[in-house]
């Protein structure tokens, strides 16, 4: 799969492949994988991809199921790249405070916060 | 500050304190703090709180600015708790796939994805 495929298209295709291969992926009934308790997904990317690794190691490869796992590894690569961009640019306190304000604002409106 | 204050109220109060103390917080003009380039904030919580630590170490403490940093440390505590919940529960492949589908669906609709 060329890495040039836009990430948004990659995600869409992966969702479709996930539905297609569901039966094969749940075949191992003894398998236990960590599942986050909350819906703040971005906080859990590490665990999600560890789970994908566990699933891949237990799934019979071949055909488009291989494409599914290849896609998922490209999505991981994209997310790792985004994580790198968290700390690459060192800016003044002024810009940091604007970003912090945005972060807290997003927490306030979009995060799923339990009381 | 009692930890019992709901996190949502804590975030609101912190936003207000941030505005109040802005001038004091930007006083050190030589300070450089990592600022993420993108808006996928949850991926960057580690760097954001490292930045807050840098800012705190360079800010003259006293009065309500102390309350600001106390609040921020409680928010960090909340997020750390959320991160712990990413891997505590081990479920069947079926549940994991439901969560993965939800994660990709959120990525598809809510994440800020550059082409």
């Amino acid at each position: 799969i060329p890495t040039e495929i836009p990430t948004s298209a990659l995600v869409k295709e992966t969702l479709a492949l996930l539905s297609t291969h569901r039966t094969l992926l749940i075949a191992n009934e003894t398998l236990r994988i960590p599942v986050p308790v909350h819906k703040n997904h971005q906080l859990c990317t590490e665990e999600i991809f560890q789970g994908i690794g566990t699933l891949e190691s237990q799934t019979v490869q071949g055909g488009t199921v291989e494409r599914l796992f290849k896609n998922l590894s490209l999505i991981k690569k994209y997310i790792d790249g985004q994580k790198k961009k968290c700390g690459e640019e060192r800016r003044r306190a002024n810009q940091f405070l604007d970003y912090l304000q945005e972060f807290l604002g997003v927490m306030n409106t979009e995060w799923i916060i339990e009381s | 500050i009692p930890t019992e204050i709901p996190t949502s109220a804590l975030v609101k109060e912190t936003l207000a304190l941030l505005s109040t103390h802005r001038t004091l917080l930007i006083a050190n003009e030589t300070l450089r703090i990592p600022v993420p380039v993108h808006k996928n904030h949850q991926l960057c919580t580690e760097e954001i709180f490292q930045g807050i630590g840098t800012l705190e170490s360079q800010t003259v403490q006293g009065g309500t600015v102390e309350r600001l940093f106390k609040n921020l440390s409680l928010i960090k505590k909340y997020i750390d708790g959320q991160k712990k919940k990413c891997g505590e529960e081990r479920r069947r492949a079926n549940q994991f796939l439901d969560y993965l589908q939800e994660f990709l669906g959120v990525m598809n609709t809510e994440w800020i994805i550059e082409s």
Epitope: R90, R91, R92, N94, Q95, D98, Y99, Q101, E102, G105, V106 | E29, T30, R32, V35, P36, V37, H38, K39, I112
Partner: antibody, heavy 119, light 107 residues
Framework: QVQLVQSGAEVKKPGASVKVSCKAS????????INWVRQAPGQGLEWIGY????????RYNQKFKGRATLTVDKSTSTAYMELSSLRSEDTAVYYC????????????WGQGTLVTVSS | DIQMTQSPSSLSASVGDRVTITCKAS??????LSWIQQKPGKAPKTLIH???RLIDGVPSRFSGSGSGQDFTLTISSLQPEDFATYYC?????????FGQGTKVEIK
């Protein structure tokens, strides 16, 4: 493709206000800050401020604080710059420009809007 | 505010010449500087960001260098379409500030 299209030229009397629009297309509007820059005839460029469409937060050059107001309409992916108490020295071409990332370089510019202040 | 001093304010050059424009910041701006080209009656266009990173689609004859306070824009071999005014912009701190511009004219 990514585009910023600005409203047409305006002629205003001293003391009046002007509101310039900047319609974004080809990208997710809330992902990038919008900056406003002006250029008086034969002069250089001057930064007015920026607005973050993600949270409506704006920051101004002190020189324009109190006179310039930056707003956005997310439903139409449009940014606005309103300048009040106009004087003849506000005659300029006003540009909107998109930040590539947070507090980053301006990767896309609008075509400019000429505002003439004359009695 | 951070002052950006650009020099020269204008220069005359011929096609094929190597042209250098400098920009000096009144304080350390790290590498948060971009170079902008503007042709008469047109909107500005960013050529280089973060002091030395060429923007996609910009010809490789343009290059930038420097960090801290001193920065340079170089056009290795001037082309007819390069006759324009060039500005430096610091986006290190608010308010963002521009140099006063360098007009590159045909000799």
């Amino acid at each position: 493709q990514v585009q910023l299209v600005q409203s047409g030229a305006e002629v205003k009397k001293p003391g009046a206000s002007v509101k310039v629009s900047c319609k974004a297309s080809g990208y997710t509007f809330t992902n990038h800050h919008i900056n406003w820059v002006r250029q008086a005839p034969g002069q250089g460029l001057e930064w007015i401020g920026y607005i973050n469409p993600y949270n409506d937060y704006s920051r101004y050059n002190q020189k324009f604080k109190g006179r310039a107001t930056l707003t956005v309409d997310k439903s139409t992916s449009t940014a606005y710059m309103e300048l009040s108490s106009l004087r003849s020295e506000d005659t300029a071409v006003y540009y909107c420009a998109r930040d590539y990332g947070n507090f980053w370089y301006f990767d896309v510019w609008g075509q400019g809007t000429l505002v003439t202040v004359s009695s | 505010d951070i002052q950006m001093t650009q020099s020269p304010s204008s220069l005359s050059a011929s096609v094929g010449d190597r042209v250098t424009i400098t920009c000096k910041a009144s304080q350390d701006i790290n590498s948060y500087l971009s170079w902008i080209q503007q042709k008469p009656g047109k909107a500005p266009k960013t050529l280089i960001h973060r002091a030395d990173r060429l923007i996609d689609g910009v010809p490789s004859r343009f290059s930038g260098s420097g960090s801290g306070q001193d920065f340079t824009l170089t056009i290795s071999s001037l082309q007819p379409e390069d006759f324009a005014t060039y500005y430096c912009l610091q986006y290190d701190d608010f308010p963002y500030t521009f140099g006063q511009g360098t007009k590159v004219e045909i000799k």
